[in-house]
């Protein structure tokens, strides 16, 4: 069987300032289990925009219904957009361990830029 | 097979405190969010509060805020509701349950419920 | 608070006959809606979750369907041991709220 990929098939996305920026992506296994999370930036300082598992994140919806368990896209929408927004965003599958989840692989990452409204 | 078994119920005067257990077996208890739901008597059904996996994100009713503390230990496979400053208004049957991942999933395993009863 | 609102409040019907129970939320729950089952004395029990996805274990007469603010429970042939008191719960965001519960009695 081959190994999951996490696929983020935009490597850029623009969004006007105030408007929703949707972020795709998709798995190719639903193996192994375990959860996504959505991070903007990479490394230890990466900032957690969603998580599947835990916690109810207001700005972020996502784009179809996580609790469908063949589900494999985990694609997300943030809502009202500012300039503090941009930066790359990265969707990354965890893999189920106790007594922590253990990272398992990430998506390229998609570049978001925010252009400023018209004045 | 799933098993959630609530504890600590009984008769109290207002204003005094409980503590309710939820004993899970028959699933890995850290891989789940918690909830307490309660039902006065003849009643619907009021979610009271909720704990996810690792307690990093934890949400009260407004009815509860200030008065009722969540809270779990993944290592004794417990999850735990303290209940202060208790009101005739929480006499209740105080059901725990669990709910797979995020904050989007159902309650797909629920206790048999232990009841509270405030009075003087 | 969304809240949620369900219809009827409670319903006489016979075995073998088709029973609809709908559910309207003050805002849109997008597919975040689940139903569950009590009996008397008894803890609720999960049926439909995320609108129209049947339980596993629950008999298949059980369907649930709806988008948005308006969603349906429906049960195409009563049989005697569903007769109970059914509610709504919707986990789009915090409160979890409840639907205020449908009885549905034998005629």
């Known amino acids: 069987e081959e190994e999951l990929q996490v696929i983020q098939p935009d490597k850029f996305v623009l969004v006007a300032a105030g408007e929703t920026a949707t972020l795709r992506c998709t798995a190719t296994s639903l193996i192994p289990v375990g959860p996504i999370q959505w991070f903007r930036g990479a490394g230890p300082g990466r900032e957690l925009i969603y998580n599947q598992k835990e916690g109810h994140f207001p700005r972020v919806t996502t784009v179809s219904d996580l609790t469908k368990r063949n589900n494999m896209d985990f694609s997300i929408r943030i809502g009202n957009i500012t300039p503090a927004d941009a930066g790359t965003y990265y969707c990354v599958k965890f893999r189920k361990g106790s007594p922590d989840d253990v990272e398992f692989k990430s998506g390229a990452g998609t570049e978001l830029s925010v252009r400023a409204k018209p004045s | 097979e799933v098993q959630l078994v609530e504890s600590g119920g009984g008769v109290v005067q207002p204003g005094r405190s409980l503590r309710l257990s939820c004993a899970a077996s028959g699933f890995t208890f850290s891989d789940y969010g918690m909830i307490w739901v309660r039902q006065a008597p003849g009643k619907g059904l009021e979610w009271v509060a909720s704990i996810s996996s690792s307690s990093s994100y934890i949400y009260y009713a407004d009815s509860v805020k200030g008065r009722f503390t969540i809270s779990r230990d993944n290592s004794k496979n417990t999850l735990y509701l303290q209940m202060n400053s208790l009101r005739a208004e929480d006499t209740a049957v105080y059901y725990c349950?669990?709910?797979?991942?995020?904050?989007?999933?159902?309650?797909?395993?629920w206790g048999q419920g232990t009841m509270v009863t405030v009075s003087s | 608070a969304i809240q949620l609102t369900q219809s009827p409040s409670s319903l006489s019907a016979s075995v073998g006959q088709r029973v609809t129970i709908t559910c309207g939320a003050s805002?849109?729950?997008?597919?975040?809606m689940h139903w569950y089952q009590q009996k008397p004395g008894k803890a609720p029990k999960l049926l439909i979750y995320?609108?129209?996805n049947l339980e596993a274990g629950v008999p298949s007469r059980f369907s649930g369907s709806g988008s948005g603010t308006d969603f349906t429970l429906t049960i195409s042939s009563l049989q005697p041991e569903d007769f109970a008191t059914y509610y709504c719960q919707q986990s789009n965001e915090p409160p979890y709220t409840f639907g205020q519960g449908t009885k549905l009695e034998i005629k």
């Open positions: 349950a669990r709910r797979y991942y995020g904050f989007n999933y159902p309650f797909d395993y």
């Open positions: 995320s609108a129209s």
């Open positions: 805002k849109s729950v997008r597919t975040y």
